[in-house]
Interface confidence: medium
């Protein structure tokens, strides 16, 4: 499945999901980690406020569901969901899917390599029982918890590397960049928004190179 | 492009010990996991084991514990598989394969035929 | 158990569609991921993850999954596609990888 194929429009876009807005735009409150984004966004201020939340309305999500998960760990699912939310500049990579609950998702967006690194390194030592984040839960209390016969491990047990956490976890929607931070070539989930958003230039690049690819991807293969 | 380039062919005697390397280029090696993969011939896929090439840690399948050791050379952006006590049901094609998640095997090394005969 | 198992043979006409299938208990909470194999030939991911294709692969090639079996369907199945094709999938418990069995297939005319 090529990431792009569906869509023509592959800049300042924003994805037909569950809670994103329909056109990007200024949004001045966005809050804390989702603040990078707030000069140009596809959430809303009340989206940034509630997905900092454990177990936050957007998604029944728990993120404690084999104990409280370290801070330090947390802060990188919680910078996953700001970009997953807000970005605009994810076009090149968004596929049409057939899900009751959203009509596309990513795949394939080439996270910087650091930024996956740090994730992981920042998370080896909170527990989850699954590898796999986007199914195989048991839903029937309203909430995600652990499927009968999943042990509650440490996340090297059920991610035993890097690429296994940020390739893995929510099905190949990121895949690991060989490009650093910075160069252009990946998207930064952590950035300074002083300096602007470094992801624009990044969208740029892989929009263009699909245009003269006539659609077919430059990089090679493999989200949310 | 990322590549995988194994070792040659070896022939070993009952009883011997053999060591397939795989180089990697292309990408990050200490990212990623890698696999090994044998298949005799005419027979099926057969999963080995694997290296986290970060921290070298390792996990074999049940079949091959005590007889298969899997290291890596970071440096030199290599893995190697070393399988011990050889005897002829070992013959078949040994492949290292690179894991994207969990299982996931994207790149593949060209094989190493390993025949092991007295 | 953490067994694959997987129907040995497979044959489908000339441009026809054709599903193989592979089964097991560790698919009710792992996706798996096929790759097709030809004689004296490393094995070549087609499909993984959730119905994800690698690029190069044609889109004649799908994936999809129900409770503990996954399956690989080819649309309009060309002669090229003639090749082994394995499943595999992640045991949860104690991080290990299973191959199924392998399909033979062959395509007819």
């Known amino acids: 499945a090529d990431p792009g194929q569906d869509r023509t429009d592959l800049l300042n876009v924003c994805m037909d999901a569950k809670h994103h807005k329909t056109k990007p735009g200024p949004e001045d409150k966005l809050h804390d980690q989702c603040s990078p984004w707030k000069k140009n966004a596809c959430c809303t201020a009340s989206t940034s406020q509630e997905l900092h939340k454990d177990t936050s309305r957007l998604y029944n999500f728990n993120w404690d569901h084999c104990g409280k998960m370290e801070p330090a760990c947390k802060r990188h699912f919680i910078q996953d969901t700001c970009l997953y939310e807000c970005s605009p500049n994810l076009g090149p990579w968004i596929q049409q899917v057939n899900q009751s609950w959203r009509k596309e998702r990513f795949l394939d967006v080439p996270l910087c390599k650091e930024d996956c690194q740090r994730w992981w390194e920042d998370c080896h030592t909170s527990h989850t029982c699954k590898s796999n984040w986007h199914r195989g839960w048991d839903w029937t209390s309203g909430v995600n918890k652990c499927p009968a016969g999943a042990l509650c491990r440490t996340f090297e047990s059920y991610f035993p590397t890097p690429a296994a956490l940020c390739e893995g976890l929510w099905s190949h929607s990121y895949k690991v960049s060989n490009y650093s931070r910075g160069s252009g070539r990946c998207i930064q989930m952590w950035f300074d928004s002083a300096q602007g958003n470094p992801n624009e230039e990044v969208a740029r690049f892989y929009a263009a190179a699909m245009h003269v690819n006539a659609g077919e991807m430059l990089h090679h293969h493999h989200h949310h | 492009e990322v590549q995988l380039v194994q070792s040659g062919a070896e022939v070993k005697k009952p009883g011997a010990s053999v060591k397939v390397s795989c180089k990697a280029s292309?990408?990050?090696?200490?990212?990623?996991?890698m696999h090994w993969v044998r298949q005799a011939p005419g027979q099926r896929l057969e999963w080995m084991g694997w290296?986290?090439?970060?921290?070298?840690?390792?996990k074999y399948s049940q079949k091959f514990q005590g007889r298969v050791t899997i290291t890596r050379d970071t440096s030199a952006s290599t893995a190697y598989m070393e399988l011990s006590s050889l005897r002829s049901e070992d013959t078949a094609v040994y492949y290292c394969?690179?894991?994207?998640?969990?299982?996931?095997?994207?790149?593949w090394g060209q094989g190493t035929l390993v025949t092991v005969s007295s | 158990s953490s067994e694959l198992t997987q129907d040995p043979a497979v044959s489908v006409a000339l441009g026809q569609t054709v599903r193989i299938t592979c089964q097991g208990d560790?698919?009710?909470?792992?996706?798996a991921n096929w790759y097709q194999q030809k004689p004296g030939q490393a094995p070549v991911l087609v499909i993984y993850?959730?119905?994800n294709r690698p690029s190069g692969i044609p889109d004649r090639f799908s994936g999809s999954s129900s409770g503990n079996t996954a399956s690989l369907t080819i649309t309009g199945a060309q002669a090229a596609d003639e090749a082994d094709y394995y499943c595999?999938?992640?045991?949860?418990?104690?991080?290990?990888?299973?191959f199924g069995g392998g399909t033979k297939l062959t395509v007819l005319g």
């Open positions: 595999d999938s992640r045991v949860s418990t104690g991080n290990h990888v299973v």
């Open positions: 292309g990408y990050t090696f200490t990212i990623y996991a």
């Open positions: 394969a690179r894991d994207i998640s969990y299982g996931s095997f994207d790149y």
């Open positions: 993850g959730q119905n």
């Open positions: 560790s698919l009710r909470s792992n996706y």
């Open positions: 290296i986290n090439a970060g921290n070298g840690f390792t």
